[in-house]
């Protein structure tokens, strides 16, 4: 059974993941220009359902394409460090949260970077609210 300390740790990790995803989304929405329109051509794969922590495997699998798009957007921009830091944070947090169980992602649809980040933000929020109620 999960201890109160492990539950608290999971909660903190979810809060951190949520924050990093929100930072990335804010960055993306700042590109209301030719860069955003390029970023929107990149496909991101979303699984059939995202309801459990093990489904974070599917987020992990899309982190490389995510970094690729954000690097394109920033180019020689000085904000590049923020992106790399957020991606790195997400990677570490996801590895902690998803556990060691192997999960095979069944991808259902392709979405834009904006939709992709929004959906994973919603996932974090729903898990956080479920665990705190």
């Amino acid at each position: 059974a999960p201890t109160s300390s492990s539950t608290k740790e999971t909660q903190e990790q979810l809060d951190q993941l949520l924050l990093d995803l929100q930072v990335l989304l804010k960055g993306v929405n700042d590109y209301k220009n030719s860069k955003l329109s390029r970023m929107l051509t990149f496909k991101f794969y979303m699984p059939k359902k995202v309801t459990e922590l093990k489904h974070l495997q599917c987020l992990e699998e899309e982190l490389k394409p995510l970094e690729e798009v954000l690097n394109l957007a920033q180019g020689k921009n000085s904000h590049g460090g923020n992106t790399r830091e957020s991606i790195s944070n997400i990677n570490v947090t996801v590895l902690k949260l998803k556990g060691s169980e192997t999960f095979m992602c069944e991808y259902d649809e392709t979405v834009t970077i904006v939709e992709f980040l929004n959906r994973w933000i919603t996932f974090c929020q729903s898990i956080i609210s479920a665990s705190s109620s």
Epitope: R38, M39, K43, T110
Partner: antibody, heavy 119, light 109 residues
């Protein structure tokens, strides 16, 4: 209603220059990236260049890089294409277009202006 | 340089279904967009992000994508669907926009 109106086309000799304009109205011009697309007579569409909403980022097709310059004046809600060292193969109808919604599709197009490069 | 490949022409009888393909190495990772251009007119966006229709575009036009091929389908093709159709996307780097060569749709009859 969104309107894009191109002007500045005409007959020009090879090696000479021409500047095209695209007057925009009906939307917040300074909020959106803008594109130039051309179409040679009887041929397909070719993307030429695009510029970010604030003019800080510009991209060009290989065929025009170093000869054409895209720019914009947000206070005049106008897009420009400065075309130098013109070649006969630059002969085309030039359209300006914009991805008006949060999509990368070009939702709105002008009616085009014809540029003919010939001696 | 990156290319999107389309058949030059497609012909169908009225009421039949026409399928126009667009092939490109980057399409598994990039969305495709489709434009319809009628004679003497500016192009019109008919499909974006592989399969979405802008408002005002009839349901007879639909899009799909699988692997390196994007497909525009015109169901129950009519004379008014006669036009040139172009696919559009970005290259492998995502930096440059590219149009396919265009496909002339002819509705026989």
């Amino acid at each position: 209603e969104v309107q894009l109106v191109e002007s500045g086309g005409g007959l020009v000799q090879p090696g000479r220059s021409l500047r095209l304009s695209c007057a925009a109205s009906g939307f917040t011009f300074s909020y959106y990236g803008m594109h130039w697309v051309r179409q040679a007579p009887g041929k397909g569409l070719e993307w030429v260049a695009d510029i970010s909403n604030d003019g800080s980022n510009k991209y060009y097709a290989d065929s025009v890089k170093g000869r054409f310059t895209i720019s914009r004046d947000n206070s005049k809600t106008t897009l420009y294409l400065q075309m130098n060292s013109l070649r006969p193969e630059d002969t085309a109808v030039y359209y300006c277009a914009t991805p008006y919604y949060d999509s990368s599709g070009l939702d709105y197009w002008g009616q085009g202006t014809l540029v003919t490069v010939s001696s | 340089s990156y290319e999107l490949t389309q058949p030059p022409s497609v012909s169908v009888s009225p009421g039949q279904t026409a399928r126009i393909t667009c092939s490109g190495d980057a399409l598994p990772k990039r969305f495709a967009y489709w434009y319809q251009q009628k004679a003497g007119q500016a192009p019109v966006l008919v499909i974006y992000e592989d399969n979405k229709r802008p408002s005002g575009i009839p349901e007879t036009l639909s899009g799909s994508s699988s692997g390196t091929t994007a497909t525009l389908t015109i169901s129950g093709a009519q004379e008014e669907d006669e036009a040139d159709y172009y696919c559009y996307s970005t290259d492998n780097t995502g930096g440059l926009w590219v149009f396919g060569g265009g496909t002339k749709l002819t509705v026989l009859g």
